[in-house]
Amino acid sequence: EDELQVIQPEKSVSVAAGESATLRCAMTSLIPVGPIMWFRGAGAGRELIYNQKEGHFPRVTTVSELTKRNNLDFSISISNITPADAGTYYCVKFRKGSPDDVEFKSGAGTELSVRAKPS
């Protein structure tokens, strides 16, 4: 297939406080080999939300089984959303490297806005 693209189909998602937010991301190709990570924000100050390779992210679950052969779906669900979670989330593909993986391509981002919890 052609060179990998990172697809985030939704420019924005709105979720009520206390609910879960699904952030969708998929790849158009299995190549190059390497993990994906989710970040909030861009640039040097971005916050790591999920790392496919390692780490403990108790509020984050993957929508698909990432270990499944030929999986292209790297969507995540973040539970118990609060106003502090608002921001733009980027799904980023890394190319496997030595000693460190190298950022390969980022999705366009999905802006998460948080509505007040219905009374």
Partner: antibody, heavy 122, light 108 residues
């Protein structure tokens, strides 16, 4: 606007062949996977075949594997379905449909043509 | 091959009522690959819900999707006259991209 227009349907005898076409406009055809879905008279939807954006990967339902061939010409913005060894049970309205995103077979099919009717009868 | 089973086959309701349509997979599937379509007589299907729970562009918020694993639901909170149609779920992703048999929502 985004549009898919199927053509090539008709009445054909069992064992014969037919080629359906689907002309796409209003979107970057070469960026999206495409599908054929059929619907027999009074019945539900049946997915038939799909093809990746570049055309290098193809997928088929078991019921048509070995008889039908999906292809595309990105320079002409056209999707094809070559149907050989046709059977009475292939009688249906055939729709072409565009994948919702650039990822093949992810999330759904968001644009559909109005369909072309294929009748297989002696 | 995963089989998608929709129930009920027919739902007879009045405008203003709530419709709950079920789609069950024969084995667990990712919600990213579950879509719902609406089809009216003589028309092509229309994508309503993708990823089990996200409304497609232009779909009114009375339509909602939910579920995970093997059990998925399409809910129409208050039926409008134009909602009487046949609804199909579809499993995407792997091949074949199976449709359920459909649920017809008819006027009571």
């Amino acid at each position: 606007q985004v549009q898919l227009v199927e053509s090539g349907g008709g009445v054909v005898q069992p064992g014969r062949s037919l080629r359906l076409s689907c002309a796409a406009s209003g979107f970057t055809f070469s960026a999206y996977g495409m599908n054929w879905v059929r619907q027999a008279p009074g019945k539900g939807l049946e997915w038939v075949s799909a093809i990746s954006a570049s055309g290098r990967s193809t997928f088929y339902a078991d019921s048509v594997k070995g008889r039908f061939t999906i292809s595309r010409d990105n320079s002409k913005n056209t999707l094809y379905l070559q149907m050989n060894s046709l059977r009475a049970e292939d009688t249906a309205v055939y729709y072409c449909a565009k994948d919702f995103t650039e990822v093949v077979g992810w999330l759904g099919m968001d644009v559909w043509g109005q369909g072309t009717t294929v009748t297989v009868s002696s | 091959e995963i089989v998608m089973t929709q129930s009920p086959g027919t739902l007879s309701l009045s405008p203003g009522e709530r419709a709950t349509l079920s789609c069950r997979a024969s084995q667990s599937v990712s919600s990213s690959y579950l879509a719902w379509y609406q089809q009216k007589p003589g028309q092509a299907p229309r994508l309503l819900i993708y990823g089990a729970s996200s409304r497609a562009t232009g779909i009114p918020d009375r339509f909602s999707g939910s579920g995970s694993g093997t059990d998925f639901t399409l809910t129409i909170s208050r039926l409008e006259p134009e909602d009487f149609a046949v609804y199909y779920c579809q499993l995407l992703g792997s091949s074949p991209r199976t449709f359920g048999g459909g649920t017809k929502v008819e006027i009571k």
